[in-house]
Structures are given as structure tokens and as C-alpha cells.
């Protein structure tokens, strides 16, 4: 039978570490991490790491009992967890019978938004105490709410990942800019900034009709030339406070009728750290 892996949590040092080993298996040939989505009961989905590793093809894999994988996550707080993946059979060949290196994977480490992860792996038995053993590590940075997968997470939806404010902004005259945007039931308070290298105007927008989408309009006084300036719309939603996803537009000249014209180049960007 071909070896498979059985993985389980192992937070402390492996028991083999306390033993003296004359010989140890070689290091891993490759270690990779990618995010995968899994459905959860709440109708949302969670993002997990798919950690896959490749064994070096030589006789030292005959000594291999397990591979230990540890993940450190750094964002607002630090997390640390390890799993030990035991091989169910001894290796009878250095490569798979069908060809190619022995490759295994573990899916289980949860992924939070916008977090840097350090993933380390080593084979067991590993080096003796006070000796450096062969190990391999990779970094993985999880995406934020603008990511095509992450934006559908409930946490991101509540932070406005699916909201398109469809901003239009035009210069009415030398002193004012008219900004129009579609509101969202996620919140009722917004900040509109006009920037042309520096901030030349801003306004708080309070939209009382929170439960339905409406088109809001605000006229903002400006202190400099506004044509070609950037409009940044920052929403304040309960779930993300001042760190909600910001949207951008560009100020153009208002048509003679006074109706602002729609823009194609609406852009979104996260405000600081995204939830």
C-alpha cells in the first residue's frame, strides 16, 4: 500500500526530539501554500490553507515517520499552531510507483483576512537537541476584502466589498464640486474628500434613509482647482468603523445642463487594515 498522511494537532515539541538519532531523513524538497474555500453551516464559507509538500527522492525517506508543520500568523494579534502528519506506511520506493515525487497535503489551518503567515515544516525524526535540523519555510500573505474570493465573505460584505457607490463628481464652478453616489443599507454616514495632491475640500454626508439604496448628492466647497482631482468616498459601517473599503472617482467639468456625468473609472481601495 502507498503511504498517506494522518494529521493532528501537536503544539509542543515532538517526542522524537528528546531521543538521540544517528541518522535522520533529509529535508523537504518543496513546500507550498495556497488558500482554499470551504463551506460552513452558517451559509458563509471559510478560507483554509492548503499546505502541500514534496519529499526528497533518496533513501533517507526510509527513516521518515512524520512531517510537522507550524504556522505563525501576524496581523493585529499573533497566532501559532502546529500539526503533525504521520505517514501511514514505510516508504518502499523513493518516488511514487506512477512516477514523480512523493507529495502530500494538509488542509486545515484557518486563514484570516490581511494576515502574514510564516509556515515552517520539518521531517520527523528531526535533528538532535542543540543541532540544526533540515527544515523548510515559506511566507503566505492572505488577501483582504478586495480579493475576488474574499469579497464574498460575510465579514467583507458587511464592510462593503460588494457595494458599488457609482461615484460621479463634477466641477460646478471654481468654488464647488458636486458629488453623487449610491448609498448602501450597510451604513448611513460617509465622508467625501476632494484631493489634488493635497485635500482641497471635504464634507460629511449623513443619509437617514439607511434601509434602502438611494442616490445621494452633496456639493462640496473647494479651495483650489478641482478639475481632474480625486474624490475619495469613505463609508462608516458598524462592522468596520473607519477601516471600511474606500472608493474613488475623478472630478470632471459639469455638463452645461448641470447634470454630473457618469464615470467609468471608479476605483476601490481598502482604508488601512481591512477586516
Amino acid at each position: 500500500r502507498e503511504p498517506t498522511v494522518q494529521c493532528g494537532s501537536e503544539t509542543g515539541p515532538s517526542p522524537e526530539w528528546m531521543l538521540q538519532h544517528d541518522l535522520i531523513p533529509g529535508d523537504l524538497r518543496d513546500l507550498r501554500v495556497e488558500p482554499v474555500t470551504t463551506s460552513v453551516a452558517t451559509g458563509d464559507y471559510s478560507i483554509l490553507m492548503n499546505v502541500s509538500w514534496v519529499l526528497r527522492a533518496d533513501a533517507s525517506i526510509r527513516l521518515l515517520k512524520a512531517t510537522k508543520i507550524c504556522v505563525t500568523g501576524k496581523s493585529n494579534f499573533q497566532s501559532y499552531s502546529c500539526v503533525r502528519c504521520n505517514y501511514t506506511e514505510a516508504f518502499q520506493t523513493q518516488t511514487r510507483p506512477s512516477g514523480g515525487k512523493w507529495t502530500f497535503s494538509y488542509i486545515g489551518f484557518p486563514v484570516e483576512l490581511n494576515t502574514v503567515y510564516f509556515i515552517g515544516a520539518h521531517n520527523i525524526p528531526n535533528a538532535n537537541m542543540n543541532e540544526d535540523g533540515p527544515s523548510m519555510s515559506v511566507n503566505f500573505t492572505s488577501p483582504g476584502c478586495l480579493d475576488h474570493i474574499m469579497k464574498y465573505k460575510k465579514k467583507c460584505v458587511k464592510a462593503g466589498s460588494l457595494w458599488d457607490p457609482n461615484i460621479t463628481a463634477c466641477k460646478k464652478n471654481e468654488e464647488t464640486v458636486e458629488v453623487n453616489f449610491t448609498t448602501t443599507p450597510l451604513g448611513n454616514r460617509y465622508m467625501a474628500l476632494i484631493q489634488h495632491s493635497t485635500i482641497i475640500g471635504f464634507s460629511q454626508v449623513f443619509e437617514p434613509h439607511q434601509k434602502k439604496q438611494t442616490r445621494a448628492s452633496v456639493v462640496i466647497p473647494v479651495t483650489g482647482d478641482s478639475e481632474g482631482a480625486t474624490v475619495q468616498l469613505t463609508p462608516y459601517f458598524p462592522t468596520c468603523g473607519s477601516d471600511c473599503i474606500r472608493h474613488k472617482g475623478t472630478v470632471v467639468l459639469c455638463p452645461q445642463t448641470g447634470v454630473p456625468f457618469p464615470l467609468d473609472n471608479n476605483k476601490s481601495k481598502p482604508g488601512g487594515w481591512l477586516p
Partner: antibody, heavy 118, light 107 residues
Framework: EVQLVQSGAEVKKPGASVKVSCKTS????????MNWVRQAPGQGLEWMGR????????QYNQKFKDRVTLTRDTSISTAYMELSRLRSDDTAVYYC???????????WGQGTLVTVSS | DIQMTQSPSSLSASVGDRVTITCRAS??????LAWYQQKPGKAPKLLLY???NLADGVPSRFSGSGSGTDYTLTISSLQPEDFATYYC?????????FGGGTKVEIK
């Protein structure tokens, strides 16, 4: 029946290159590493390197690293060994040898004599 | 690199003799050892792998033993076709090295 059939003898001048082929049959080519071993006249065996036909991973004996190139063509189940900047002491019989489950050499080609002479 | 030292480099024996060849590795190779037989003008032929396992078609008069760094090839009753050169080889990770060879000649 597993067979490894090598290309014919070569005579080369110092500084030239030689490319030896090893055509295999009777097994799944991508499932086993292919090794190259040489034997100078009246001397012992010397491992030069190995290639995994599955993904072309190569490991060389440091002694030959700068001069030897191992390749393979999976479409014709053939491995190749090219040795460059030949010297007179490269005169030897060159063997391809297929690994077993680990790197014991279960099957060997018939050998290719490469003579380097000015 | 692991060095493989074979002894003797040559020996003379008669048909029916018991012949022993030894091979010493410069470090523990964890029984990852093979033995080959080579006749003049021919490619080497695998005799044993993993110290004790006979390759296909190899007569049972050939046997191997040993562990760690010291290994032995024994031919229990030498036959005319056994006069050849014998090599040990470790496969405990590249680079693989061979012993210098033992030439078994007719006494």
C-alpha cells in the same frame, strides 16, 4: 523485458563535446530515475549524476557539475548525457543505469566507449 | 561524500571455495548498500540490494550481511562463472559512490 540501449562508440578531440543516448523499453520511463556511471579503462565505477524523467530534476556529482548535462525526451523514452570540454582522462565507457525502488542500479545499458584523443 | 573502501582488491580462489569480500563505508549508510558483478567488456550486473536482497535471477550462493558501516558479500561455493570483479555501492543519498572493486581470479 526491461532494456536500455545506448548509442555507439565515439572518438572526440580534446575540448569537444559528446552526447550519449540511452533508449529504454519494457517499463514506464517516468517512474524511475536514470543514472549515468562511467568507467575509465582498467578503473572502477564512478557515478556522474541522475535525472528524474518525470520532472527533469537532476542531481550531479560535483566533480562533473560544470561539464555534464543530463536531459530526457519522454516521448521516445530516451535519456541523454552530454559531456563538454572533453579531456584525455574522460576516455571511458559511459553507462546509463536505471534505479530500482531506491538508487541501486537494477538495469544497465551496454555502455558507450568515448575515446578522447588528439 | 561517503567513501567506500573494499577489500581485498583481488583474491585467488578455486571452484567450490567460500569467498568473502568486505566493504566499509566512511559513515553509517543505514544498510543502503548494493553489490554488483562485472565481467570484462560487459556492463555491471546487480547481485544484491539492501544488503541482503537477491536481485532477480541471482543464484542463492550469493549472500550479503552487515549494517552501519561494515558489509560483507559471501559466495558460499565459487563457480566457474563467478570469476569476475565485484563492486559495492552505497545509495544513502547522492552522490553515490562505489568501492574500488575486488577481482576474483582462478587460483
Amino acid at each position: 523485458e526491461v532494456q536500455l540501449v545506448q548509442s555507439g562508440a565515439e572518438v572526440k578531440k580534446p575540448g569537444a563535446s559528446v552526447k550519449v543516448s540511452c533508449k529504454t523499453s519494457g517499463y514506464t520511463f517516468i517512474s524511475y530515475w536514470m543514472n549515468w556511471v562511467r568507467q575509465a579503462p582498467g578503473q572502477g565505477l564512478e557515478w556522474m549524476g541522475r535525472i528524474d524523467p518525470y520532472d527533469s530534476e537532476i542531481q550531479y556529482n560535483q566533480k562533473f557539475k560544470d561539464r555534464v548535462t543530463l536531459t530526457r525526451d519522454t516521448s521516445i523514452s530516451t535519456a541523454y548525457m552530454e559531456l563538454s570540454r572533453l579531456r584525455s582522462d574522460d576516455t571511458a565507457v559511459y553507462y546509463c543505469a536505471r534505479s530500482g525502488g531506491f538508487d541501486w542500479f537494477a538495469y544497465w545499458g551496454q555502455g558507450t566507449l568515448v575515446t578522447v584523443s588528439s | 561524500d561517503i567513501q567506500m573502501t573494499q577489500s581485498p582488491s583481488s583474491l585467488s580462489a578455486s571452484v567450490g571455495d567460500r569467498v568473502t569480500i568486505t566493504c566499509r563505508a566512511s559513515e553509517n549508510i543505514n544498510s543502503n548498500l548494493a553489490w554488483y558483478q562485472q565481467k570484462p567488456g560487459k556492463a555491471p550486473k546487480l547481485l544484491l540490494y539492501d544488503v541482503t536482497n537477491l536481485a532477480d535471477g541471482v543464484p542463492s550462493r550469493f549472500s550479503g550481511s552487515g549494517s552501519g558501516t561494515d558489509y560483507t558479500l559471501t559466495i558460499s561455493s565459487l563457480q566457474p562463472e563467478d570469476f569476475a570483479t565485484y563492486y559495492c555501492q552505497h545509495f544513502w543519498g547522492p552522490p553515490y559512490t562505489f568501492g574500488g572493486g575486488t577481482k576474483v581470479e582462478i587460483k
